[in-house]
Interface confidence: low
């Protein structure tokens, strides 16, 4: 019986109408012949927010939202023709809905397409300086997109662009089954995972691609993907979805014999986000929609945030569960998933692990090898057969730290915002839903920092109609939140302290890390200000020791007022 | 390894009807659009009809449009083109093939001959 | 008459760079990917490049494609008496809402 089980009521509901009438939503509520606002991309230095769309690419003020530049690009006629000769929908897939868009250099970002079941991929120019106030197409430069941007517009791509080169997960054929990791762009020959394998890959939904160091030395950098598939055979009984981690090193170029242009340092492991079940059997939250990767001093270490929900239609639920990666290194080098033919069940692998290990970087860090061509046979070999490893990734304190089953939505969005209080650091989680609504959720350590409580701190309505958001981007210098759906983009302020009330106990009650009582008003909490009378207590929300009688009084009617 | 294996040609008068196959192996053929390409003795190639992995569309080139039918059987990994009142001009060896945006894998191909 | 055009036939000696032209019009070979296709003497047809420049695995690097607006062009460097054959460039072709050839073009490697 978790305190974290419980669907806790929010402090502040706030609906659509609510939001605008206090001056707490911007939105942008999209053009007439565009839709699906997907595809973000935060630029702090040039406080612009970019957003691929249906046929547009926007640039967005992260001041003010409605201030904003775009770029049409739609497909050529004969393209749509083409696509609906196809059988396909005119409207919902004959068009370039963007699904990729990274910073390539300084002056450029890459930006890929549907191109109506035809993907393609250009740069667009952004200037050196925010002042330059360039946004244009290099439309004299398409390229193609296959293996960058899938061909339907249903299904995502997770990218990552680093060194002038292109890491994605996607669909990379027409009929949306060549589920493949790629490395394109830069100067080497395109790589990929092995095809029709569903050891490798098995019907996967990417969800994001990063790039995390593993030591000090840049050549053992890794790319992490995060995906949902298809569990192999044997791996559960009937069909199942699996939450997966998947690894590759920055350095992988392939093998020479075999796996040729081929990864040869892919590795997988699933990830665990569940809650013991009444009967003793597990509830397991596998559908992973939505990652975040809250950075720590040591880059090495980012906290894994993943939002989950349930497969089941009967049982409707969603998760948020966090991860070390200490804990996905140790896994990653653990015990390989094996099984001696396709009836039978996965075990781990007893036999003898080639040297160097599968999974580790060619560098001088862990052995002698200078590139993934010079590995032995035995090595690629091992690495084709075995890209799973047996044990799971389970989350810091063996279960989510926040879940939600009996309400009308589900988690589908995540970021997560590291807040300084008075008496201590918060993570904030702001996270979106699949009827517009987005949750902003403190975690408060109980008995110890490792126990956490989560607090639902608002509920916010941020598009008229209920509709599904799809990407969210969080800009700490404007302290600002972004949102984006099919209908359009929102903009809301990290913090509403004004809206807590006109009393000392109301500010303190709230247990906002961002707000606390400045002696008149509850404003935003600033931990370098000299302020003396900061009246603030995240942990226990107790105003009876914070706040003067005056303030007290105001207790009762913030009781009244929200529950 | 990819094989596409025809069958079904042969010597027909004008106005009757074939019926070829193709059978496939060595790929997912439910993953795959497939297509018939034919050449005429001595002649070039010519796409004559192509359809969707799960049948949900198909396509015919002008010269065989309401006398051809493509159609295919997922279970059994099998291509077929349904040819009625045929014409001298529809004699040529008639190749299945793969789709992957292009023609990827080919058959051998099977004769068809159309005698007046 | 075929609606991308190729030259009937393209000759050179062993060691020589041959190359064959494909012109077509915007509703194939503008707006769409080329593909050319080697068929060898009593042989099916096999494919050499897709999306206009790529080879596909076991196509030696001796074969490469390009395209520039409405027009393809398929060569061949150091060419060898194995790569005696017909050669035919095709392309979706938008407006005919089919696949189009070209009429081939006979390749002879001399001497």
């Known amino acids: 019986n978790y305190a974290n089980g419980k669907n806790n009521v929010p402090r502040l509901k706030l609906s659509y109408k609510e939001m605008l009438e206090s001056n707490n939503v911007i939105t942008f509520n999209g053009l007439a012949n565009s839709s699906s606002y997907h595809t973000f991309l935060l630029d702090e230095e040039r406080s612009r927010l970019y957003v691929g769309a249906k046929d547009h690419i926007f640039s967005f003020n992260l001041v003010n939202i409605k201030d904003f530049q775009k770029i049409v690009w739609p497909v050529s006629y004969t393209r749509r023709d083409e696509c609906k000769w196809a059988g396909k929908d005119i409207l919902k897939e004959c068009a370039n809905f963007i699904k990729v868009l990274e910073a390539y250099n300084q002056t450029h970002l890459y930006a890929c397409g549907t191109g109506a079941f035809h993907p393609i991929c250009t740069y667009i120019e952004v200037g050196h300086h925010p002042e330059d106030n360039i946004f244009k197409l290099q439309d004299s430069h398409f390229e193609n997109g296959r293996g960058k941007s899938p061909y339907d517009p249903k299904l995502l791509t997770a990218s990552l662009l680093i060194d002038g080169e292109l890491y994605s997960g996607t669909a990379a054929d027409f009929m949306g089954r060549d589920f493949a990791i790629f490395r394109t762009l830069g100067h080497h020959h395109p790589i990929r995972t092995e095809q029709h394998d569903s050891r490798w890959l098995n019907d996967p939904r990417f969800i994001s691609a990063h790039l995390i160091p593993e030591s000090d030395n840049p050549e053992d950098d890794k790319v992490y993907f995060f995906f949902r598939e298809n569990a192999i055979d044997g791996e559960h009984s009937g069909k199942a979805t699996h939450a997966r981690i998947g690894q590759i090193c920055k350095n992988d170029f392939g093998g020479h014999r075999s796996l040729v242009n081929k990864w040869t340092t892919f590795l997988k492991a699933r990830l665990i986000c569940s809650v013991p079940g009444p009967n003793g059997i597990d509830t397991h939250f596998d559908e992973l929609q939505d990652v975040f990767l809250m950075n720590s001093k040591d880059p090495k270490n980012p906290i894994v945030y993943g939002v989950f929900t349930t497969s089941s239609n009967i049982f409707k639920g969603s998760a948020v569960c966090m991860y070390s990666m200490s804990d996905v290194r140790r896994v990653f080098l653990g015990p390989y998933a094996h099984r001696d033919g396709p009836n039978y069940q996965w075990v781990p692998y007893q036999g003898r692990v080639p040297y160097p290990r599968p999974g580790t970087c060619p560098s001088k860090t862990f052995g002698g090898f200078d590139s993934t061509k010079d590995l032995p046979d035995d090595v690629i070999t091992f690495a084709r057969s075995h890209p799973a490893m047996y044990n799971p990734v389970f989350p810091i304190n063996n279960r989510p730290i926040m879940i939600k089953t009996d309400v009308n939505y589900q988690f589908t969005q995540i970021v997560v915002d590291r807040v300084d209080a008075e008496d201590g650091q918060y993570d904030v989680m702001f996270i979106g839903t699949d009827v517009g609504t987005v949750l902003k959720v403190v975690s408060v350590p109980k008995e110890t920092w490792h126990d956490l409580e989560e607090i639902l701190l608002e509920e916010m309505t941020v598009f008229r109609e209920p509709t599904t958001i799809s990407a969210m981007e969080l800009s700490t210098k404007q302290q600002q939140l972004y949102i984006g759906s099919t209908a359009g983009v929102a903009q809301l302020p990290l913090h509403r302290c004004d809206i807590y009330g006109k009393a000392c106990a109301e500010c303190c009650l709230a247990r906002d890390p961002y707000c606390a009582w400045d002696g008149s008003s509850c404003s935003r909490y600033f931990p370098t200000a000299k302020a003396r009378t900061r009246a603030q207590d995240i942990r226990n929300g107790d105003p009876l020791t914070h706040c003067s009688d005056g303030g007290i009084e105001g207790r009762m009617d913030h009781h009244h007022h929200h529950h | 390894e990819v094989q596409l294996l025809e069958s079904g040609g042969g010597l027909v008068q004008t106005g009757g009807s074939l019926r070829l196959s193709c059978a496939a192996s060595?790929?997912?053929?439910?993953?795959?659009?497939m297509s018939w390409v034919r050449q005429a003795p001595g002649k070039g190639l010519e796409w004559v009809s192509w359809?969707?992995?799960?049948?949900?569309?198909?396509y015919y080139a002008d010269s065989v449009k309401g006398r051809f039918t493509i159609s295919r059987d997922n279970s059994k990994n099998t291509l077929y083109l349904q040819m009625n009142s045929l014409r001298a001009e529809d004699t040529a060896v008639y190749y299945c093939a793969k789709l992957n945006g292009d023609f990827d894998y080919w058959g051998q191909g099977t004769l068809v001959t159309v005698s007046s | 008459q075929s609606v991308l055009t190729q030259p009937p036939s393209a000759s050179g000696t062993p060691g020589q760079r041959v190359t064959i032209s494909c012109s077509g019009s915007s509703s194939n070979i503008g707006n769409n990917d080329v593909s050319w296709y080697q068929q060898l003497p009593g042989t099916a047809p096999k494919l050499l490049i897709y999306?206009?420049?790529h080879r596909p695995s076991g196509v030696p690097d001796r074969f490469s494609g390009s395209k520039s607006g409405t027009s393809a062009s398929l060569a061949i460097s150091g060419l060898r008496s194995e790569d005696e054959a017909d050669y035919y460039c095709g392309a979706w072709d938008s407006s005919l809402s089919g696949y189009v050839f070209g009429g081939g073009t006979k390749l002879t490697v001399l001497g």
């Open positions: 999306a206009d420049s």
């Open positions: 060595g790929f997912t053929f439910s993953d795959y659009a």
């Open positions: 359809i969707y992995y799960d049948s949900g569309s198909k």
